[in-house]
Structures are given as C-alpha cells and as structure tokens.
C-alpha cells in the first residue's frame, strides 16, 4: 500500500501567544509529508498545510473565527511525492492533537510600557494595548477588546536606589501611583488573567523602564513627555 512506510506524527503541541497559534509535531519527515486538519467539536474537518515537509502549521486563521470554541487538530502522514488519488481507500496514519481552547489557553505576550508621566508625586504608567489577529467585521481587535475585564495588569515599581519592590494592579491599561519627590523609579508590568487556573495565567514581565530615560521624564513642572 502507499502508506506502509509512513510514520504517524507524534508530540502534537499547540504554541499560541496573543492568539497567534501554531501546531507543532514530530518527527522531521524522511520520505513523507504531512497534511493538517482542524475542527471544532461540532464542526467539519478543514484541511490546512497540504502535503508539507514542515513540522508546524499556522492555524491562526481558523481559530480566530471563534476564540471561545474548543478545537481539535490531526496530522496525516503521506509518502513523499504523494498525489491525492480519488481511488485510494486506505486512510493514512494520523495523530490527534490535544484539545485547544484559544481564549483559555493562548499565552499572554510580553507587555510593553508605552509611556510614563510624572506630575509632582504622582506617576501615570500606561501599558501598550497589543493588537491580535482576532477580527470583528473587518477590524482587528486588541487584547483588551477580546479579554475585556478578564485581563488585568500588575505593575512592579521600585526606587532606582533600592531593591524593595511595590506592586499595583489595574483592570485598565493605566496605573496612577504615588512616588517620593526627587526619587527616580523603575517599572515593569505583567499581564494577568486571574480567572485562569493554569500556568498561562501570567505573561512574562515587560522590559524594565526607568525614570530619567527615554520613555518618560521626572518633571516637577507638570510637563509630560511621551515616547512615540
């Protein structure tokens, strides 16, 4: 038969950040190629990445149609040089992926501090709202558009001259914190979805930004400096 020398894929793994979603698997093909199918629990199978020699397939376009659905994928193995034959009755070997629910399982990408502004003893820190590939009509939605109040940010901040960290939380993308006059502070933020129960509740920390550098200035006069 045409499939006797093909090996079923294994270690099917979803890699997803901010809804950019790729299915990966093994092994690296020797004399075989792969086709991926994806489906919701109640839907039909849709084929993607036809007869590819890669061991990954970008399924973002499919999952962003409904990020709150649960998806299943499967990877079929075919002999290299395989051409679809209508007369073929033998099903090629395949392996199923774990189920994947994007809304619950996509990792939160590393956030970025967009700007900070000091007025007297207050500092306003703004987190950049990341764009996703999720659409409403023909408009791409931001992370906040998709997650709404499910998404919060934690701010870590500390005096440049010491190591003692303080924290603040917001369910918007802005923090307003009290600081000591004349002190420079450093900031880092983390995206969090508190209602998740797994390791992907939190993003990695943003790069650290410190006052007196290019993203913002300490100004007693109340002037603002935005980083563009």
């Amino acid at each position: 038969s045409g499939t006797t020398n093909t090996v079923a894929a294994y270690n099917l793994t979803w890699k997803s950040t901010n809804f950019k979603t790729i299915l990966e698997w093994e092994p690296k093909p020797i004399n075989q190629v792969y086709t991926v199918q994806i489906s919701t629990k109640s839907g039909d199978w849709k084929s993607k990445c036809f007869y590819t020699a890669d061991t990954e397939c970008d399924l973002t376009d499919e999952i962003v149609k409904d990020v709150k659905q649960t998806y299943l994928a499967r990877v079929f193995s075919y002999p290299a040089g395989h051409v679809e034959s209508t007369g073929s009755t033998e099903e090629p070997p395949y392996e199923n992926s774990p189920e994947f629910t994007p809304y619950l399982e996509t990792n939160l990408g590393q956030p970025t501090i967009q700007s900070f502004e000091q007025v007297g003893t207050k500092v306003n820190v703004t987190v950049q709202d990341e764009w996703t590939l999720v659409r409403r009509n023909d408009t791409f939605l931001s992370l906040r558009d998709v997650f709404g109040k499910d998404l919060i940010y934690t701010l870590y901040y500390w005096k440049s001259s010491s190591s003692g960290k303080k924290t603040a939380k917001t369910n918007t993308n802005e923090f307003l914190i009290d600081v000591d006059k004349g002190e420079n502070y450093c900031f880092s933020v983390q995206a969090v979805i508190p209602s998740r129960r797994t390791a992907n509740r939190k993003s990695t920390d943003s790069p650290v930004e410190c006052m007196g550098h290019e993203k913002g200035e300490s100004r007693e006069t109340g002037h603002h400096h935005h980083h563009h």
């Epitope: 629990k41 409904d66 709150k68 629910t101 987190v127 709404g148 109040k149």
Partner: antibody, heavy 120, light 113 residues
C-alpha cells in the same frame, strides 16, 4: 442555538435556602461567564455576580456576598445560584445570563428567569 | 461603585416618534487603551428577560433593528429610537460593563401616549 433554561418557580419560608439552576446549550459552556441578575417585583435590575465555569472563578456584588453562592457543573453545562437564610426581600425573579463574545460586551443571552417567593 | 442614572424615568410617546433616553455614569466608562466605552443598553418587556440592544456604547447587537442607536463617551450616553414601532414600548436599562461591580441604571419606562 444558544439557550439558557432555568429551573422552575420556588416558594420558600424565611430562613430556608434555595438553589436555582441554569442549563446552558448551544455554545462552549466553559469559556463564557454566567451572570446572575436579581429583579424584585416592579423594580429594576441588580447584578449579583458571575462565575466562569472553566475555573470556577467568581465575582460577587458586595450586597450578596455571604448569602449567595455561585457554582457550575461543567459535565452537565449547568450553573447554579444558591441563596441561604432567605428573607422576604429575596422575593424576586432571578435571571442567569451569558456574557458576550467580545470583552465587556454585555449580557448577550438570558434565561427565562426563576421566580423565588419567600413567605411564611 | 459606579452609579448609573437614567433620565427620564418614564416617557410617553407615539408610534413614529423619535425618542432619546440618556444615561449618566458617576465615573468614566472610557477605556483609554482601546478607546471603547463599556456602556450597554437593554430592552425589557413585562414578564420577559432583558434583551441586549447595544454594547460598547454604540455597537448594535446582531439582529437589533437599525432604528436603535447608541452614542456618547466618558460619562454621558444616549439611546435613540429613530422612529418608534409598537413593539418598542418597554423599559430600557443602561449598564456599566466597565468595572466590577457591574451596575444598572434604574430604567426608563417607555409608554404609549
């Protein structure tokens, strides 16, 4: 088709407890918040709180903390509202609703409501 | 908590009229990160569950007639019905969907004149 079907009317005595169920169908139950809303006769709507069935995570309106408890059984796609130590002012229609698809996009689907009457 | 205040509390109008209901929040419902206002409008008829009309202050829910429109930003919002139909006589509620606890306005009852 998304549907939320609630349990039937209840008549309870003061001090008793009641458990209202909300059976969901037509969508992925675990990924949407189930909201609970109280409406006393002839009055407006009051948000009680919500639960995300996936994790059991809850938010409560302070006015209902302590006596109201939300739970969900994902195996039967059903959410529950339990109210203990019932008082006359708990007489109301209780609605379950499902959050919208997008973030903060309202309560898109509603159950038919369950009338709870508290009377001695 | 964010307080939601609707006006008027009741309103009499005729079929074909243009009707406006206002809603004020005690704090801004504008998310600075994505410039969306998290204000929702519902319609409720006697003995029935509420029905979602408008979310994000101005986005009509699927299937809602185009005569319903929402506008406003920050703390001041408006629901407009451009030409009243017999089935529009009901009570209308606005809701803060921005931050917990979620809060409703007291309602505006729209009656036939």
């Amino acid at each position: 088709e998304v549907q939320l079907v609630q349990s039937g009317s209840e008549l309870k005595k003061p001090g008793a407890s009641v458990k209202v169920s909300c059976k969901a169908s037509g969508y992925t139950f675990i990924t949407y918040w189930i909201e609970w809303v109280k409406q006393r006769p002839g009055q407006g709507l009051e948000w009680m709180g919500d639960i995300l069935p996936y994790s059991g995570s809850t938010n409560y309106n302070e006015n209902f903390k302590g006596r109201a408890t939300f739970s969900a059984d994902t195996s039967v796609s059903t959410a529950y509202l339990q109210i203990s130590s019932l008082k006359a002012e708990d007489t109301a229609v209780y609605y379950c609703a499902r959050s919208g698809y997008y973030g903060n996009s309202g309560f898109a689907y509603w159950g038919q409501g369950t009338l709870v009457t508290v009377s001695s | 908590d964010i307080q939601m205040t609707q006006s008027p509390s009741s309103l009499s109008a005729s079929v074909g009229d243009r009707v406006t209901i206002t809603c004020k929040s005690s704090q801004s419902l504008l998310s600075s990160s994505n410039q969306k206002n998290y204000l929702t409008w519902y319609q409720q008829k006697p003995g029935k569950a509420p029905k979602l009309l408008i979310y994000w202050a101005s986005t009509r829910e699927e299937g809602v007639p185009s005569r319903f429109s929402g506008s406003g930003s920050g703390t001041d919002f408006t629901l407009t019905i451009s030409s009243l139909q017999p089935e529009d006589f009901a009570t209308y509620y606005c809701q803060n969907d921005y931050t917990y606890p979620l809060t409703f306005g007291q309602g505006t009852k729209l009656e036939i004149k």
